[in-house]
């Protein structure tokens, strides 16, 4: 006696006692025709006719994955025994949003975990969350198709004044973080050099406090603080900034020696190393990548290399001695 003995008769499924031979036989020596795969799926071992007892495997198109039991079995009556199987999207489709909103990055499909940022033209802010993440096959939080841009209260208040200021008669005065910032304004990730900590702050409050000469506050990036390369670079950039000879106001930010203020986005964008001008006496002795040789670079080159996330160790300020 062998527990494996089955006289060669295949079972339909592990959890079924019936064997193929026990099924009522209907005239169908021809087997089974090709089954219909679920939407966005296809038959892996595709052919015109399948033998009784033969399995077909359901596969899904790129961007979809099988949910359920993905095998169909050909029964003697010429039909298929199939469990519930479907092809579920594993990516999110680019959301349909109102034309006034800009999606960054702009792609047709987004992988799970990828995020998008919605932005508005200058002087307007998104009337709701601006950051969305692809989870499963949908966006979190859900993106409302009525989502639009609204006039930025900061812009309304400031009149002809700079950000963080408001018009008072014919002159510009700093906004009060308490009195002038009760309205909604977009979130910024901010670093406080005094407390050596970063936190999320409404744009209005950050700009008002910066105007009131709180020099210890540094803009890191738009959106709430989230661990990752953007935050990491923001912090490193703040450390490097103390030696920068250039400090150019740009939207919420201040651009340094290794950056240019983008006129269209009012954001500081890192230059690429070849765009650095040689001038300046802010020099550093560095080691590049896994190289053992030392190199003298100016602050612009150091900033661009670190911004590009290339490996570089700063040995000391000033020229290399060798």
């Amino acid at each position: 006696f062998s527990i494996m003995e089955n006289n060669g008769q295949p079972c339909i499924n592990d959890d079924e006692e019936m064997k193929e031979v026990d099924l009522p036989e209907i005239e169908a020596d021809s087997g089974c025709p090709q089954p219909v795969p679920p939407e966005n799926g296809f038959i892996r071992n595709e052919k015109q006719l399948y033998l009784v007892g033969e399995d077909v495997e359901i596969s899904c198109l790129t961007g979809f994955e099988t949910v359920g039991y993905q095998y169909f079995r050909c029964l003697p009556d010429g039909t298929w025994r199939q469990g519930d199987v479907e092809c579920q999207r594993t990516e999110c489709i680019k959301p349909v949003v109102q034309e006034v909103l800009t999606i960054t990055p702009f792609q047709r499909l987004y992988r799970i975990g990828e995020s998008i940022e919605l932005t508005c033209p200058k002087g307007f802010v998104v009337a709701g969350p601006s950051r969305y993440t692809c989870q499963g096959n949908s966006w979190t939080p859900p993106i409302s198709n009525s989502l639009t841009c609204e006039k930025d209260t900061l812009t309304k208040l400031k009149g002809h004044c700079q950000l963080g200021q408001k018009q008072s008669g014919s002159e510009c005065i700093c906004m009060s973080p308490e009195e002038d910032c009760s309205h909604h304004s977009e979130d910024l990730c901010v670093f406080d050099t005094d407390s050596n900590d970063y936190f999320t702050s409404p744009a209005c409050k950050f700009l008002a406090e910066k105007c009131l000469n709180n020099q210890q506050l540094h803009f890191l990036h738009i959106g709430s603080c989230q661990d990752g390369r953007q935050l990491e670079w923001g912090l490193e950039r703040t450390r490097l900034s103390s030696n920068s000879t250039k400090k150019e106001s740009c939207g919420y930010d201040t651009c340094y020696d290794w950056e240019k203020c983008s006129a269209s986005t009012s954001k500081c964008v890192c230059l690429l190393p070849p765009q650095c001008f040689k001038g300046g006496n802010q020099l550093y002795c560095v080691k590049m990548g896994s190289s053992t040789s030392e190199k003298t670079l100016n602050i612009c080159e150091v900033g661009t290399i670190r911004c590009a996330n290339r490996k570089m160790e700063i040995l000391h300020p000033g020229k290399c001695l060798a």
Epitope: Q230, K260, P273, Q275, C276, K278, K295, N309
Partner: antibody, heavy 118, light 112 residues
Framework: EVQLVESGGGLVQPGGSLKLSCAAS????????MAWVRQAPGKGLEWVAT????????YYRESVKGRFTISRDNAKNSLYLQMNSLRAEDTAVYYC???????????WGHGTLVTVSS | DIVMTQTPLSLSATPGQPASISCRSS???????????LYWYLQKPGQSPQLLIY???DLGSGVPDRFSGSGSGTDFTLKISRVEAEDVGIYYC?????????FGQGTKLEIK
């Protein structure tokens, strides 16, 4: 006014060598990285090589590594491209380019034609 | 290497009418700190290329404001609001987000 003038192009046999020059004027040459960009006849543009201010760092596209050498002489306000083991696919107009804070290739010379043929 | 694909390859435009060129990259040009290094150049007949647009949407020095750039990730567009006779030539997109820097194959603009 920034001016870049290339010279040294011509007809050369496969396997041969050629040295291109670029004379720069209208700016402090030693303050800028410089680059070579090429354009095959009737084709698109292709970055070839870049050099830093003093020539201590050079960067090349994979297909020319080991065959081409970019160099500069700051005293003469000149950029060079020494091309060895030339191939038919190196046939192109070679442009000398200078960056600005706007772009890597903000200023271009008029180009010099290199033809590699037997 | 990143492949830059431009469409259409040639374009016949009417003076005073708008024109648009698309450029698609084989990989996202948005880097991990949020910067996108995408440029547009115009090469007029018999001339060397000239910079039109840098960083996706910033206008190069001395470039007329009828030119504009937009897009993000892998899809970018150059628009001319009103084509003029002097706009003829070959338009190239170029990326510098990933080494080596690569150009599109070019789009030839002609005037009807």
């Amino acid at each position: 006014e920034v001016q870049l003038v290339e010279s040294g192009g011509g007809l050369v046999q496969p396997g041969g060598s050629l040295k291109l020059s670029c004379a720069a004027s209208g700016f402090t040459f030693s303050d800028y990285y410089m680059a070579w960009v090429r354009q095959a006849p009737g084709k698109g543009l292709e970055w070839v090589a870049t050099i830093n201010y003093d020539g201590s760092s050079t960067y090349y596209r994979e297909s020319v590594k080991g065959r081409f050498t970019i160099s500069r002489d700051n005293a003469k306000n000149s950029l060079y491209l020494q091309m060895n083991s030339l191939r038919a696919e190196d046939t192109a107009v070679y442009y000398c380019a200078r960056p600005s804070t706007e772009a890597l290739f903000a200023y271009w010379g008029h180009g010099t034609l290199v033809t590699v043929s037997s | 290497d990143i492949v830059m694909t431009q469409t259409p390859l040639s374009l016949s435009a009417t003076p005073g009418q708008p024109a648009s060129i698309s450029c698609r990259s084989s990989q996202s040009l948005l880097n991990d700190v949020g910067n996108t290094y995408l440029y547009w150049y115009l090469q007029k007949p018999g001339q060397s290329p000239q910079l039109l647009i840098y960083l996706v949407s910033d206008l190069g020095s001395g470039v007329p404001d009828r030119f504009s750039g937009s897009g993000s990730g892998t899809d970018f567009t150059l628009k001319i609001s009103r084509v003029e006779a002097e706009d003829v030539g070959i338009y190239y997109c170029m990326q510098a987000s990933h080494a080596p820097y690569t150009f599109g194959q070019g789009t030839k603009l002609e005037i009807k």
